[in-house]
């Protein structure tokens, strides 16, 4: 889960057999990873296994029932959970991205890698555009970033820009490429004849 | 299901300015998608002319320059474009769209607007 | 920008005909990482905005009729109507959905002789 910290993986050890309720146990290495890794479609686990058997929600595992709140796929009635009288399992598999295609944080979707860091949000989230680093290089120069930097709330395109000036942040994305307006777009009347 | 509508001037005299508002109804437009303007001149030619985003984000044509400048009314589900300095090349007739979640295609359309620049 | 170039600029067919159109790209449209080509084909009627019919050059929209045959890759796509229908005349449009900005051939007209 290339947008998580390393630090949410803590090593257990194969022997130990027991990881923290809202971590899956690697099952080679032993390593905890969060369950929310769990069928993610990447592979945290060295030997993979956080993505096999990712047609049923692994949602009885420690004997939680019903998961703890934030996991992935919400358990539904699984038969070993105590008094539930649906037996059927909740198919929460989530198809794999394609090869060369990214996942957007908060949702299923997948898109091509060429559209991250391309100035266009195509994540409902915009995740595709996030976190694109200081200092980066753009491709293809073909504008300079002039004029005052303006916030990620008024992100505009990035795309066949080059970048002059002070470090393009989260904090101060400057309006260069295909843009030509830098503001957010947002009123709060009906418009106006310019 | 989602409907989109625009709604504008018929005519426009040319260096002045249109604006047009395109009204969403069975979706709201900070939740998701992209919201786009397109427009198709006389002779059918179809232009791409820029978005809003759901998180407020706007990116247009550059063929468009500054004239361009796509905003919205999250109060009243609408977004707008305004283009200025308006010639007779801009007559054409102008579509709100959108597209499937992250897609660059266009599956919902409003009926269309007629704009003449005209003096 | 990327040009798109659709061939020919008009057709006339009969009812039951196979027709096929051609759009060129002046840039590929073939994304390496997962091999999808980004390319949609619209069908236009008079007074009507353009529905879509196919994307990723290749697959139909739901409800389309199976018709409507998208093919190609890289830079040659094409669309074929194995048996025209009477309501199949129209303008048909491709477009570049793969890099900003969006870009659309001038159009295919289908007439009836």
């Known amino acids: 889960s290339p947008l998580s910290t390393p630090t949410s993986a803590q090593a257990a050890g194969p022997s130990s057999g027991s990881c923290p309720p809202t971590k899956f146990q690697c099952r080679t290495s032993g390593l905890c990873v969060p369950l929310t890794w769990r069928c993610d479609r990447d592979l945290d686990c060295s030997d993979g296994s956080d993505e096999e058997e990712c047609r049923i929600e692994p949602c009885t595992q420690k004997g939680q029932c019903p998961p703890p709140p934030g996991l992935p796929c919400p358990c539904t009635g699984v038969s070993d959970c105590s008094g539930g009288t649906d037996k059927k399992l909740r198919n929460c598999s989530r198809l794999a991205c394609l090869a060369g295609e990214l996942r957007c944080t908060l949702s299923d979707d997948c898109i091509p890698l060429t559209w991250r860091c391309d100035g266009h949000p195509d994540c409902p989230d915009s995740s595709d555009e996030l976190g694109c680093g200081t200092n980066e290089i753009l491709p293809e120069g073909d504008a300079t970033t002039m004029g005052p930097p303006v916030t990620l709330e008024s992100v505009t395109s990035l795309r066949n820009a080059t970048t002059m000036g002070p470090p393009v942040t989260l904090e101060s994305v400057p309006s260069v490429g295909n843009a030509t307006s830098s503001s957010a777009g947002d009123q709060s009347g009906s418009p106006t004849a310019y | 299901d989602v409907q989109l509508q625009e709604s504008g001037p018929d005519l426009v005299k040319p260096s002045q300015s249109l604006s047009i508002t395109c009204t969403v109804t069975?979706?709201?437009?900070?939740?998701?998608?992209?919201w786009h303007w397109i427009r198709q001149f006389p002779g059918n030619k179809l232009e791409w002319m820029g978005y809003?985003?759901?998180?407020?984000?706007?990116n247009y044509n550059p063929s468009l320059k500054s004239r361009i400048s796509i905003t919205r009314d999250t109060s009243k589900n609408q977004f707008f474009l305004h283009l200025s300095s308006m010639t007779n090349e801009d007559t054409a007739t102008y579509y709100c769209?959108?597209?499937?979640?992250?897609?660059?295609?266009?599956?919902?359309w409003g009926a269309g607007t007629t704009v003449t620049v005209s003096s | 920008d990327i040009v798109m170039t659709q061939s020919p600029s008009s057709l006339t067919v009969t009812a039951g005909e196979k027709v096929t159109m051609s759009c060129k790209s002046s840039?590929?449209?073939?994304?390496?990482?997962?091999?999808?080509?980004?390319l949609t084909w619209y069908q236009q009627k008079p007074g009507q905005p353009p529905k879509l019919l196919i994307y990723?050059?290749?697959t139909r929209k739901s409800g389309v009729p199976d018709r409507f045959t998208g093919s190609g890759s890289g830079t040659d796509f094409t669309l074929t109507i194995s048996s025209v229908q009477a309501e199949d005349l129209a303008v048909y449009y491709c477009?570049?959905?793969?890099?900003?900005?969006?870009?659309f051939g001038a159009g295919t007209k289908l007439e009836l002789k």
């Open positions: 769209t959108r597209p499937p979640v992250v897609t660059r295609y266009f599956d919902v």
């Open positions: 069975g979706y709201s437009i900070t939740s998701d998608y992209s």
């Open positions: 809003i985003h759901s998180s407020g984000i706007t």
């Open positions: 840039q590929g449209l073939l994304d390496s990482g997962n091999q999808k080509n980004y």
């Open positions: 990723w050059a290749s």
């Open positions: 477009q570049n959905d793969y890099t900003y900005p969006l870009t």
